[in-house]
């Protein structure tokens, strides 16, 4: 098995691939790529390697979260001499190789972006055969997914002493500002943002005491748009009905 010295450096910006006689391993990825939820994004990744004219079997891998150990979201394999990298894994069918690994390009397209795709991604290439070698991006590319606000839940809940409270949860990136409006609240009441632990895109605002019957409206807004939803409070002999 032929191995050559690996250079563990990684360029954080897409830099021009140099062509010295003794090429070293390196990977070029941008620090961040931004796109809107629902759209597609391209994660660029190009590499250099020391194995001139290598045309043996290769595997291209993209993983999420952390290098080396994170879950794979995409994997394809190309047979000796083939430029076709046959997909072996594409999580939810949304990942597709745009680049040609034979030409040192592992760029990946991600379709139908969701806020959950907002993670760091790492590209990796593996050679097998006469040459047994591999290299993986250590820093990766951060996919920043933006999204207009969407109210995911609005509800009226009982609270102590026969009172009621309203909760509104919205998602978006940037995290939306939430405001309540309703009877005796004036035009609107700004809510303090409270992103949930582990749910960075979710924001919840509470109206702790609903003192009047009527319609309560939650408005979520960020730089990409706004959304609103309402609940209705009707107290009949101490009972409540809520509808959105």
């Amino acid at each position: 098995f032929v191995r050559t010295k690996i250079d563990t450096t990684e360029n954080l910006l897409n830099t021009e691939v140099h062509s010295s006689p003794a090429q070293r391993w390196s990977m070029q990825v941008p620090p961040e790529v931004s796109a809107e939820a629902g759209d597609a994004a391209v994660l660029p990744c190009t590499f250099t390697h020391p194995h001139r004219h290598y045309d043996g079997p290769l595997t291209a891998i993209w993983r999420a979260g952390e290098p080396y150990a994170g879950p794979q979201v995409f994997r394809c394999a190309a047979a000796r001499g083939s430029e076709l990298c046959q997909t072996a894994l594409s999580l939810h069918g949304r990942f597709r190789l745009l680049g040609n690994p034979r030409r040192n390009d592992l760029s990946l397209r991600v379709e139908r972006l969701a806020l959950a795709d907002d993670r760091r991604y790492f590209c990796r290439v593996e050679f097998a055969g006469d040459v047994h070698d591999r290299y993986e991006s250590r820093h990766g590319v951060r996919l920043h997914v933006t999204a207009a606000p969407r109210i995911v839940n609005i509800s009226v809940l009982p609270s102590p002493a026969h009172a009621f409270r309203a909760l509104c949860t919205a998602e978006g990136e940037p995290p939306p500002a939430l405001a309540w409006s309703g009877p005796a609240l004036g035009n609107s009441l700004a809510a303090v943002r409270s992103p949930r632990e582990g749910h960075g895109h979710l924001v919840t605002a509470e109206l702790p005491a609903l003192t009047h019957d009527g319609r309560y409206t939650c408005t979520a807004a960020n730089s990409l748009g706004r959304s609103e939803a309402s609940v209705y409070l009707f107290r009949f002999h101490g009972a409540s009905g809520a509808s959105t």
Partner: antibody, heavy 122, light 107 residues
Framework: EVQLLESGGGLVQPGGSLRLSCAAS????????MSWVRQAPGKGLEWVST????????YYADSVKGRFTISRDNSKNTLYLQMNSLRAEDTAVYYC???????????????WGQGTMVTVSS | DIQMTQSPSSVSASVGDRVTITCRAS??????LAWYQQKPGKAPKLLIY???SLQSGVPSRFSGSGSGTDFTLTISSLQPEDFATYYC?????????FGQGTKLEIK
């Protein structure tokens, strides 16, 4: 639960054969290279063999080349080691181990079975 | 083949001590090095991979460093459960090779 469970060890005479199995569960078996690593009594760890996720590439230590065959059945999530022409120096606990993060390479072994003892003696 | 040499082969230490184990490769292996812990009668357990990445679930008192030919495993403050044998392993090229082990004993 993510685990590996070896079986098939035992006492065998020199020149004999044995087939070890390793049943995997809790992860996508075909996505990872798998290996056998052994440890002679009171000694250190010795890599024996590795097979790629799809089974198309196999690698062996010189000490077992031509005598041992690694294989896998991805439909059964099972790894095998066929050991022929066994020698006294093959006496060891045999562990199966999963590669971290790759179907071709073992950057490290992040999951190990409990081991199965193989004793070669007359 | 790449030879991996660990030192010391054994070390005695007390709970709370800082312990360093070194591993030297016979040739440049970049950072393709892993560290394992093994207790008697048990399978090895991965601690560190790619020289310095801490395996999920491993306490942060364990750390790895180094690149090229010289590598170090450090336990910042020994706990009773850390007394075991530690192995380094190179995954730079086949055949994958392990160090001979370092036995960490209670002083």
């Amino acid at each position: 639960e993510v685990q590996l469970l070896e079986s098939g060890g035992g006492l065998v005479q020199p020149g004999g054969s044995l087939r070890l199995s390793c049943a995997a569960s809790g992860f996508t078996f075909s996505s990872y290279a798998m290996s056998w690593v052994r440890q002679a009594p009171g000694k250190g760890l010795e890599w024996v063999s590795t097979i790629s996720g799809g089974g198309g590439s196999t690698y062996y230590a010189d000490s077992v080349k031509g005598r041992f065959t690694i294989s896998r059945d991805n439909s059964k999530n099972t790894l095998y080691l066929q050991m022929n022409s066994l020698r006294a120096e093959d006496t060891a606990v045999y562990y199966c181990a999963k590669a971290i993060g790759s179907s071709w390479y073992s950057d490290a072994f992040d999951l190990w079975g409990q081991g199965t003892m193989v004793t070669v003696s007359s | 083949d790449i030879q991996m040499t660990q030192s010391p082969s054994s070390v005695s230490a007390s709970v709370g001590d800082r312990v360093t184990i070194t591993c030297r490769a016979s040739q440049d292996i970049s950072d393709w090095l892993a560290w394992y812990q093994q207790k008697p009668g048990k399978a090895p357990k991965l601690l560190i991979y790619v020289a310095s990445s801490l395996q999920s679930g491993v306490p942060s008192r364990f750390s790895g460093s180094g690149s090229g030919t010289d590598f170090t495993l450090t336990i910042s403050s020994l706990q009773p459960e850390d007394f075991a044998t530690y192995y380094c392993q190179q995954s730079y090229s086949i055949p994958y090779t392990f160090g001979q082990g370092t036995k960490l004993e209670i002083k």
